[in-house]
Amino acid sequence: WPPPGTGDVVVQAPTQVPGFLGDSVTLPCYLQVPNMEVTHVSQLTWARHGESGSMAVFHQTQGPSYSESKRLEFVAARLGAELRNASLRMFGLRVEDEGNYTCLFVTFPQGSRSVDIWLRVLAKPQNTAEVQKVQLTGEPVPMARCVSTGGRPPAQITWHSDLGGMPNTSQVPGFLSGTVTVTSLWILVPSSQVDGKNVTCKVEHESFEKPQLLTVNLTVYYPPEVSISGYDNNWYLGQNEATLTCDARSNPEPTGYNWSTTMGPLPPFAVAQGAQLLIRPVDKPINTTLICNVTNALGARQAELTVQVKEGPPSEHSGISRN
């Protein structure tokens, strides 16, 4: 039979409530009574699905009773007050607390009214990203590592890069029961072009307001890549002195530069100054192949450049001449 008034009393609660492992959480639950409706609440009850009995009861004469008194508390219900708020606080959340709970009001004249709430127990993961320093292998190897430690549920890790690469993701149980540690490796064939470039590890988790982005600066160890610059094929007798530069890219940094020629040591007109070679003015044509040999911890590489100083146009050209 329909109760008096215009509408029924309704229990209002969120369908899902998140809480953090080890923390406390409030399961909100309220009785909504329409304006024209009257109701009397004599008891509030919380029960967990799949378990016999109730975990918390607030009775209008007996007050609160709990299955685990140190972990549960009615936050608003008071003896002698109208029982409209059944919200229950749970302390020291455990993994096993996750599940479905029923909040129930015993009302007169309507009867009992209930709602189910899913309690989700989360653990916020700690995230780190680090470079995996590699050498040129010719094979795909892990070049960056991203770890999300102790998440519940497991975090989602993705990689963002314009270098290509493939992720390799694995999971192991976390230190705390019910948590998961996710490790993702970013795999690519190492090359010198990749050294110093960035890749981004993106970690997504229910507990984050927005994804966490961790940038990794890649490191590839490789021997020197050498070239010589400063010569324009246009050097003539009578021109100013010039400088050649031995350009070397390497990781780690070059430890030494050695200039020579195919014939052996440098001729007198060439003076080595580290990565640079000073070519002094000459008074007769030359045709010499210069060699720059660069060393780093991984080895030595060299570049050659054949330099000609020709008879030719007047000294308006850049080049080599006496002052």
């Epitope: 008096p4 109701t39 009850t45």
Partner: antibody, heavy 115, light 107 residues
């Protein structure tokens, strides 16, 4: 101490009506809903209905609709149940009981319907 | 309407024993079940509410359990003063319904 004091035994003729009272003390009358329960001789308990003294809201067992009427008098903290068109089947002990579930009980009123 | 069934009309026990009175609801009543004790010539007395919680002053030898449709009142270390009728009652929905009662007899 919460007390529910019911009126004395009644001997009534078939077809007549009777009004049983339940005077309460020891608590605020409007705080607890009041219910009425019938127990026929040697039988189980039967819920007749309940009333919220605060607003007069009632809920009746369909089996007793038209048979029982529940009222309250807030000024005297008393609940009443009127039974009408009595027959011999209505002979029973009638209890008033406060709160859900029924925590506080009156001592019972014996109603005998006999010609 | 919900029907509460107490299948044992009588139970015989001895002082010091443990006895369990059962009650079955015809549909889910959650934990909204109370147990009452009625001694001869007296009004019923509330023992248990919400299936498993004792009212203040009720000896802890009375224990209630169950939820959904199956409920039990257990009396451990039965005393002679426990001779009474025991009724279960659902208060999840109206009309409130009582079981037919179980009479506990002391040998």
């Amino acid at each position: 101490e919460v007390k529910l004091q019911e009126s004395g035994p009644e001997l009534v003729k078939p077809g007549a009506s009777v009004k049983i009272s339940c005077k309460t003390s020891g608590y605020t009358f409007t705080e607890y809903t009041m219910h009425w329960v019938r127990q026929s001789h040697g039988e189980s308990l039967e819920w007749i209905g309940g009333i919220d003294p605060n607003n007069g809201g009632t809920n009746y067992n369909q089996n007793f609709k038209g048979k029982a009427t529940l009222t309250v008098d807030k000024s005297s903290s008393t609940a009443y149940m009127e039974l009408r068109s009595l027959t011999s089947e209505d002979s029973a002990v009638y209890y008033c009981a406060g709160v859900i579930p029924l925590e506080y009980w009156g001592q019972g009123t014996s109603v005998t319907v006999s010609s | 309407d919900i029907v509460m069934t107490q299948s044992q009309k009588f139970m015989s026990t001895s002082v010091g024993d443990r006895v369990s009175v059962t009650c079955k609801a015809s549909q889910n009543v959650y934990t909204n079940v109370a147990w009452y004790q009625q001694k001869p010539g007296q009004s019923p007395k509330a023992l248990i509410y919400s299936a498993s919680y004792r009212y203040r002053g009720v000896p802890d030898r009375f224990t209630g359990s169950g939820s959904g449709t199956d409920f039990t009142l257990t009396i451990s270390n039965v005393q002679s003063e426990d001779l009474a009728d025991y009724f279960c009652q659902q208060y999840n929905s109206y009309p409130l319904a009582f079981g037919s009662g179980t009479k506990l007899e002391i040998k």
